[in-house]
């Protein structure tokens, strides 16, 4: 049903009124305001911004706006003892040192408290040794090195280029390979798009630019010292030795000028193939160690960062629902940045601010949403999704009973080519219907819908005439809501053309050059893409909070479950002999998917026909829809990842950013041919099929008629 049937509705107070109130000029103004100084988590500046947002959300008209604080483990460089990397000669003299910080961008020369590039949560240490170049440090890169090239990384310092996978996975892989240190760098092949100038004359990364970022492997734990529970005033904290996800070897990031100096001397093995070569004028030799004349020189890391328990602040705003105040639709994005946060996160925070202002305007005119909307400005996302996770841990009982949906609102843009959406299949139809009603901001699509330009530029690989919608992975604040609590979640932003731009993310990601001017001059001068993202995110929240029947279609889940079952079966069928030997069958899973499909179809028919004027039946049907995502949660979690509990989706074990389907089965099958005990390994595959089949069947039954 249309949103117009929601409460206290007048013709003026519908989705159109909400969308019409969103203004590009306001988003621009808010972005400027949020990006003039750094807002690093745990700093006074970020606390002041939290209080400013609290005050402004109250002025905008929310019913209440509170700060929720937690004391979590953060990481900072030592101000008097900077981190750097050296090349040392045989006498131990430092003959080359990497930069201590990035040259500041024009207009920001006198800004204080710019944190120098560092890898958050790196342990202290001064390892020295030979260098090994490990490409992107992916699982497959280490397989290539160790299995094919017979290169041993044990006791070596490895240098890896950023890109392809989450940096924490790189560090974990290096640790498992026995490395004693990791140097991360941005290669121009990944962070310098051809034909574009470097900042401040374009959106490319200068040679002195460096990507900051955390290197944790939290697997959804939140604060490393209080996994599973909020880091509140009476929290019991683990000792640092028992903390979750901390790296055990020193790690440090550098730019491509400094990387050139390290890589140009590399000797040893040649790169195995062209996929290991970047764009620097170096041989990309793997090592170990330097070539001929330089073979006595070593690399030494000097890392002095410290881990500190520090107070962080979320801002939580409430717009109470008129009919179902105990049903929560959440819009959340983070506020903390590495430096200025021109894109990450403030392009998202500015959009949230304008969405709150628009909802507040409607509320001041007498309107209320049907369901409660919660708005969140999360802290310490950059340090491991800490603010959102701690708040969700503190409120988990409420959320698991009342949480309808979570819409994430980090960076609004990572390009200006087309829309990018990742969400639960329950939201596919909502996103399709909404984007058909919105105007495309794209050149050449004047007067056309957003759906049309999106579908043209980013077509679905499976369904013609439909746009691509991706699986949710992690690396952002939806993680705890979706992967741990099973609350239907989605995210949307404008993105680049992935076909022509092969670089990873956007070039200036997490560097000092991510400024307001970067956005205003190069990405979105008219802020029309920001406005479109505001309309998508805000429109989704509006519909989720206001539709009489929740805008979820369970049939879309049935479709993807079949696709995922086919995919995982195909992977398993690469081992036909073992499947036969160990009696591995997917029959139970396919049967459960078939049952789910049939039950979902019948449920959808009932959804069309039931008496929507009966509040009890309406609530019952909506609850079945709301709790469907919850039904995919296994309370025991995935093996060795207790906070990843969704059986259908989890962040890839090899790349936190990517989503994996049927992750339990996938991980059990991964590299199974190398397992020392095949019987045990295939037994785990069978167990995971059983868990998946049971879960799908159990979820299907939540959609059956209740009696």
């Amino acid at each position: 049903k249309s949103s117009n049937e929601a409460t206290n509705i007048t013709p003026k107070h519908n989705m159109k009124a909400f969308l019409d109130e969103l203004k590009a000029e306001n988003i621009k103004k808010f972005l400027y305001n949020f990006t003039q100084i750094p807002h690093l988590a745990g700093t006074e500046q970020n606390f002041q911004l939290a209080k400013q947002i609290q005050s402004q959300w109250k002025e905008f008209g929310l019913d209440s706006v509170e700060l929720a604080h937690y004391d979590v483990l953060l990481s900072y460089p030592n101000k008097t003892h900077p981190n750097y990397i050296s090349i040392i000669n045989e006498d131990g003299n430092e003959i080359f040192n990497t930069s201590l910080f990035e040259p500041p961008p024009p207009g920001y020369e006198n800004v204080s408290d710019i944190v120098p590039p560092f890898s958050a949560f790196s342990p202290q240490g001064m390892p020295e040794g030979d260098l090994v170049y490990v490409n992107y440090a992916r699982t497959e890169d280490f397989f290539k090195l160790e299995r094919d090239m017979k290169i041993n990384c044990s006791g070596k310092i490895v240098i890896a280029r950023y890109g392809k996978v989450f940096r924490g996975n790189k560090v974990k892989n290096a640790q498992l390979a026995g490395a004693k240190g990791v140097i991360l760098y941005s290669d121009p092949a990944d962070y310098f798009a051809p034909g574009v100038k470097s900042y401040p004359d374009g959106w490319n990364l200068p040679g002195g630019g460096v990507q900051r970022g955390n290197i944790l492997n939290l697997n959804g734990a939140g604060d490393p010292l209080t996994p599973g529970y909020p880091a509140n005033e009476y929290a019991y904290r683990r000792g640092i030795a028992e903390a979750v996800g901390l790296p055990s070897i020193p790690v440090h990031p550098i730019g491509y000028y400094d990387a050139q100096k390290l890589l140009e001397k590399m000797g040893g093995s040649a790169p195995p193939d062209s996929s290991w070569r970047g764009s620097l004028k170096v041989p990309y030799n793997v090592g170990p160690g330097f070539t001929g004349n330089f073979s006595t020189q070593k690399v030494k890391m000097h890392i002095h960062s410290t881990n500190e328990v520090t107070r962080i602040y979320n801002v939580i705003g409430t717009l109470r629902g008129a009919v179902e105040p105990d049903r929560y639709v959440i819009l959340g994005g983070h506020r903390d940045s590495w430096v200025f946060g021109g894109i990450d996160p403030q392009s998202g925070a500015a959009v949230v601010h304008e969405i709150v202002r628009s909802f507040g305007t409607l509320k001041k005119e007498g309107w209320r949403p049907r369901r409660t909307i919660l708005f969140a400005s999360w802290d310490a996302e950059e340090f491991g999704l800490l603010g959102s996770t701690e708040w969700a841990e503190e409120n988990s009982r409420l959320l698991q009973e009342r949480g309808v949906a979570y819409i994430n609102a980090d960076s609004s843009i990572e390009g200006n080519y087309t829309l990018r959406v990742d969400c639960t299949p329950l939201m596919y139809s909502l996103v399709h219907n909404l984007t058909k009603e919105l105007k495309s901001p794209d050149e050449g699509f004047e007067g056309k819908s957003l759906y049309e330009s999106w579908t043209k530029k980013s077509p679905s690989p499976e369904f013609s005439g439909m746009p691509r919608i991706s699986k949710l992975g992690s690396g952002n604040d939806f993680e705890v809501f979706f992967q741990r609590l099973g609350i239907a979640s989605g995210r949307a932003r404008y993105t680049k053309n992935w076909e022509t731009n092969k670089f990873s993310g956007y070039p200036l990601y997490h560097s000092v050059y991510e400024t307001y001017e970067l956005v205003e001059k190069f990405y979105d001068p008219m802020f029309k893409y920001h406005l479109t993202v505001a309309q998508v995110r805000g429109g989704m929240v509006f519909e989720l909070a206001n539709s009489i029947v929740l805008p979820f279609d369970c049939r879309d889940y049935a479709v993807v479950l079949r696709k995922y079952a086919d995919k995982i079966y195909s992977i398993s069928m690469k081992h036909p002999q073992e499947m036969k030997t160990y009696s591995v069958s997917f029959d139970s899973l396919f049967s459960a998917v078939k049952n789910f499909t049939e039950i979902a179809s019948k449920f959808s028919e009932r959804l069309q026909d039931f008496d929507k004027s009966n509040p009890i039946v309406l609530r019952m049907m909506n609850d079945q829809l709301m709790f469907l995502e919850r039904a995919f949660i296994d309370p025991l979690g995935l093996p060795d990842r207790p906070f990843y509990r969704h059986v259908i989706y989890a962040p890839s074990s090899h790349n936190k950013y990517a989503g994996e389907s049927f992750p339990g089965i996938y991980d059990a099958l991964f590299d199974i041919e190398s397992k020392v005990d095949p019987s045990k390994a295939w037994g785990e595959v069978k167990r995971q099929i059983y868990v998946a089949a049971f879960t799908v069947q159990a979820a299907a039954e939540t959609l059956s008629e209740v009696a």
């Epitope: 080359f96 201590l100 990035e102 040259p103 020369e109 470097s198 900042y199 200068p206 002195g208």
Partner: antibody, heavy 120, light 106 residues
């Protein structure tokens, strides 16, 4: 051969104006930031101004802002420095220089310099 | 603005001597550049990004340092090395130069 040749120097009275030119050859002019640097007699080097690839952004030493204007004509491979309200302390050798790496570059190619004398 | 102070301002040395010129910044910079200038001539780029020798610069020259303290070293002074050397920072606008170190024959 990469070359920068300055011209336009000479004697000028205090309060007067002068325009210096720098002709570039041997490289793709529009691919580089350019700069002016000066050196007073018997003194050290002083950066005056920078200009980006297409002339859309200019950067000046605070002490000279408002009196000096840097510009370029990429079609003529020429850099300019317009100097107004000249003072005796502006007497110096003026060098045109190429920035090696955009905004953050250093000066990797220098002209031979042109002498400006401000005197009555 | 970042001030660069070179020491010594002038230095008398003999052919074959090892010579070190220092450049101290008023606040931390990521790199220093060095130029050589001979009388009546334009400066020449000599060392870039602290430790990289410009094209044609002999290997007896080396550069090192980080933060606020940088050095240019000549391992064995040759007759053609007598000149004035300037350090420069291009880290924080505006670009600034040291006052110069004049290297003279003893």
């Amino acid at each position: 051969e990469v070359q920068l040749v300055e011209s336009g120097g000479g004697l000028v009275q205090p309060g007067g104006s002068m325009r210096l030119s720098c002709a570039a050859s041997g490289f793709t002019f529009s691919d580089y930031y350019m700069a002016w640097v000066r050196q007073a007699p018997g003194k050290g080097l002083e950066w005056i101004a920078n200009i980006n690839y297409d002339g859309s952004n200019t950067y000046y030493a605070d002490s000279l802002k408002g009196r000096f204007t840097i510009s370029r004509d990429n079609s003529k491979n020429t850099l300019y420095l317009q100097m107004n309200s000249l003072r005796a302390e502006d007497t110096a050798v003026y060098y045109c220089a190429r920035n090696w790496d955009g905004y953050y570059g250093y000066f990797d190619v220098w002209g031979q310099g042109t002498t400006v004398t401000v005197s009555s | 603005d970042i001030q660069l102070t070179q020491s010594p301002s002038s230095l008398s040395a003999s052919v074959g001597d090892r010579v070190t010129i220092t450049c101290r910044a008023s606040s931390s910079v990521s790199h220093i550049y060095w130029y050589q200038q001979k009388p009546g001539k334009a400066p020449k780029p000599w060392i870039y990004r602290t430790s990289n020798l410009a094209s044609g610069v002999p290997s007896r020259f080396s550069g090192s340092g980080s933060g606020t303290d940088y050095t240019l070293t000549i391992s064995s002074l040759q007759p053609e090395d007598f000149a004035t050397y300037y350090c420069q920072q291009y880290h924080t606008y505006p670009p600034t130069f040291g006052q110069g170190t004049k290297l003279e024959i003893k």
